[in-house]
């Protein structure tokens, strides 16, 4: 299925990476949660791969094509 | 605590061109979206553009495309919106706000008025 | 381009009623819609995001639902600082905002 590179993106409502302490932003839910399809405004937000969207956080998050990583799914894996 | 300081507002006649900032403070500036939401007097909201986190990825209103170009400096903390060809529709007080799709925290805007 | 239609554009109301705007998008967006209050002056406040959700430090009596097209923001029991101006946006297809009911002390 790829590879899952959560989204820099975090729509104000949660911090952009998990070890950062964000308590005065966070929302009442958990980190954790289901997907669904990503705004139509992502439609080319993941270069190579796939677009979700994460919604307890809100933000759109790539599952990348094999071989590419990055948030955008923007490099080539060189260890691929 | 979260802060955004919109700066370089002002008058300017139509055609003209005017850069916005926005310096942010109390978080992570670099790990955020950010927006540029605008509020003709005595109307509603519009948004005007928003930059992911890395400046990569940016999208525009309609009615400002090809005209406002929205930048950031992350080692600075700021925010841009470079306006030209301004016209009188142009004028707002111009937000900038934290996040992409939804605006968490918003400064306290930046007048521009476009007059001849 | 997706449009926003609340109604009612403006309405009166006492402290203590329970008061309803609805927002109307042009085509279906699911969930995505946000609920901001602004009050003359100063900038927006996120109240409610994915249609229904409650924004952090929010008070309770602010509710939001709807999917698809029709989406209601609704204020339980109204407080004297509850008398702003309530705008709806969508965020599916590029960010719109409502036109934004304004509501007054009666």
């Known amino acids: 299925d790829g590879n899952s590179t959560r989204s820099p993106e975090t729509n104000g409502l949660l911090c952009g990476d998990p070890d950062e302490n964000c308590a005065a932003t966070t929302t009442q839910s958990k980190r954790k949660g289901h997907f669904s399809r990503c705004p139509k405004q992502y439609k080319h937000y993941c270069i190579k791969g796939r677009c979700r969207f994460v919604v307890t956080e809100q933000t759109p998050s790539c599952v990348c094509d094999e071989g590419y990583i990055g948030a955008r799914c923007e490099r080539v894996d060189l260890f691929y | 605590q979260v802060q955004l300081l919109e700066s370089g507002g002002g008058l300017v006649q139509p055609g003209g061109s005017l850069r916005l900032s926005c310096a942010a403070s109390?978080?992570?500036?670099?790990?955020?979206?950010i927006s540029w939401v605008r509020q003709a007097p005595g109307k509603g909201l519009e948004w005007v553009s928003y930059?992911?986190?890395?400046?990569?990825?940016?999208n525009y209103a309609d009615s400002v495309k090809g005209r406002f170009t929205i930048s950031r400096d992350n080692s600075k903390n700021t925010l841009y919106l470079q306006m030209n060809s301004l016209r009188a529709e142009d004028t707002a007080v111009y937000y900038c706000?934290?996040?992409?799709?939804?605006?968490?925290?918003w400064g306290q805007g930046t007048l521009v008025t476009v007059s001849s | 381009d997706i449009q926003m239609t609340q109604s009612p554009s403006s309405l009166s109301a006492s402290v203590g009623d329970r008061v309803t705007i609805t927002c109307r998008a042009s085509?279906?967006?699911?969930?995505?819609l946000g609920w901001y209050q602004q009050k003359p002056g100063k900038a927006p406040k996120l109240l409610i995001y994915a249609a229904s959700s409650l924004q952090s430090g929010v008070p309770s009596r602010f509710s939001g639902s709807g999917s698809g097209t029709d989406f209601t923001l609704t204020i339980s029991s109204l407080q004297p600082e509850d008398f702003a101006t309530y705008y709806c946006q969508q965020y599916d297809a590029l960010n719109t905002f409502g036109q934004g009911t304004k509501v007054e002390i009666k």
């Open positions: 085509q279906g967006i699911i969930s995505y």
């Open positions: 109390g978080f992570t500036f670099s790990r955020y979206w």
């Open positions: 706000a934290r996040g992409g799709s939804l605006f968490d925290y």
């Open positions: 930059i992911d986190s890395t400046g990569t990825f940016i």
